[in-house]
């Protein structure tokens, strides 16, 4: 059974990843829009299901392009390094997820774009967060 | 209402320059890509390139990179498409259109160009 | 450069089903969108996002996608959608865009 220290832990990573991803969905809509539509072209996949930590495969699955997709973003206007934030999410998606289990991710039919891809996960944080509290 | 016109169709010689032009209304022209399609006689749409006209960042293709240049004059919501010296090969509609979002949503009822000696 | 590929012709009779592929290495990671244009016209956005239709644009025109490939489904097939069905999409860059060769659908 979860200690209340794990769980603390657990929620600290939550929170962590959670302040990352909206960060980079706020530095996506101050990037001068639309010139966003250009990252919009991209299409991400989204899970079937999402309510457990373990269903963070299918968010670790998606950093690679979403690194990709960001550092079509590097200008004045948007400060992010991504292969530093993608790397700090990586850090955190393993330690939540675990790695002693394996996981196949099942992705949903319809893909997504960054803006909604970014959101789904954002809301996947905030109720699992919700639930440690 | 949104809407793209553009200048009417030119007839001209090989060797001459031209400037055609798309006229944005309706809506913020600043803040929305326009790109410019080429379709020959008979033929499918080819993609030139893409201006964003708040501050003229531009994308070509390769196929017409230093061929054509596009332009815009932000001011008065126009997009510009001009060659230096025109060949009978440039023969072509040329459509401009809005890229938003959800793709090329609005277009220009297209400008013929005939070049001929 | 990059492309797309499209069949060059479908033929297909009044109330039946057309399907238009479209094929290009970079669609798994690129949203497609689809084309129809009539003789004489500019052509007009039919669906966006691979799957989505814009408002105005009949309930029969549907759009798929299953990793390098695109489909414009049209359903109960009408002597009016007798035009020429083009995909674009972009690049794995995001860089360029490109349409695909073009599809003339046919009505018997």
């Known amino acids: 059974a979860p200690t209340s220290s794990s769980t603390k832990k657990t929620q600290l990573q939550l929170e962590h990843l959670l302040l990352d991803l909206q960060m980079i969905l706020n530095g996506i809509n101050n990037y001068k829009n639309p010139k966003l539509t250009r990252m919009l072209t991209f299409k991400f996949y989204m899970p079937k299901k999402a309510t457990e930590l373990k269903h963070l495969q299918c968010l670790e699955e998606e950093l690679k392009p979403l690194e990709e997709v960001l550092n079509l973003a590097q200008s004045k206007n948007f400060h992010l390094r991504p292969r530093d934030l993608i790397s700090n999410i990586n850090v955190i998606v393993l330690e939540l997820k675990g790695s002693e289990t394996t996981f196949m991710c099942e992705y949903a039919d319809e893909t997504a774009t960054i803006v909604e891809f970014l959101n789904r996960w954002i809301t996947f944080c905030q109720s699992i967060i919700s639930t440690l509290t | 209402e949104v809407q793209l016109v553009q200048s009417g169709a030119e007839v001209k010689k090989p060797g001459e320059s031209l400037k055609i032009s798309c006229k944005g209304s309706g809506y913020n022209f600043d803040t929305y890509w326009i790109g410019w399609v080429r379709q020959m006689p008979g033929r499918g749409l080819e993609w030139m390139g893409t201006i964003y006209p708040a501050d003229s960042d531009t994308r070509y293709s390769p196929s017409f990179q230093g061929q054509v240049t596009t332009s815009a004059d932000k001011s008065i919501s126009t997009a510009y498409l001009q060659w230096g010296s025109l060949r009978a090969s440039d023969t072509a509609m040329y459509y401009c259109?809005?890229?938003?979002?959800?793709?090329?949503?609005?277009w220009g009822q297209g400008t013929m160009v005939t070049v001929s000696s | 450069s990059y492309e797309l590929t499209q069949p060059p012709s479908v033929s297909v009779s009044p109330g039946q089903t057309a399907r238009i592929t479209c094929s290009g290495d970079a669609l798994p990671r690129q949203f497609a969108y689809w084309y129809q244009q009539k003789p004489g016209q500019a052509p007009v956005l039919v669906i966006y996002k691979d799957t989505e239709r814009p408002s105005g644009i009949p309930e029969r025109f549907s759009g798929s996608s299953s990793g390098t490939t695109v489909t414009l489904t049209i359903s109960g097939v009408q002597a009016e959608d007798e035009a020429d069905y083009y995909c674009q999409s972009a690049d794995s860059s995001g860089t360029y865009h490109v349409f695909g060769g073009g599809t003339q659908l046919t009505v018997l």
């Open positions: 259109a809005r890229f938003s979002s959800s793709a090329y949503d609005i």
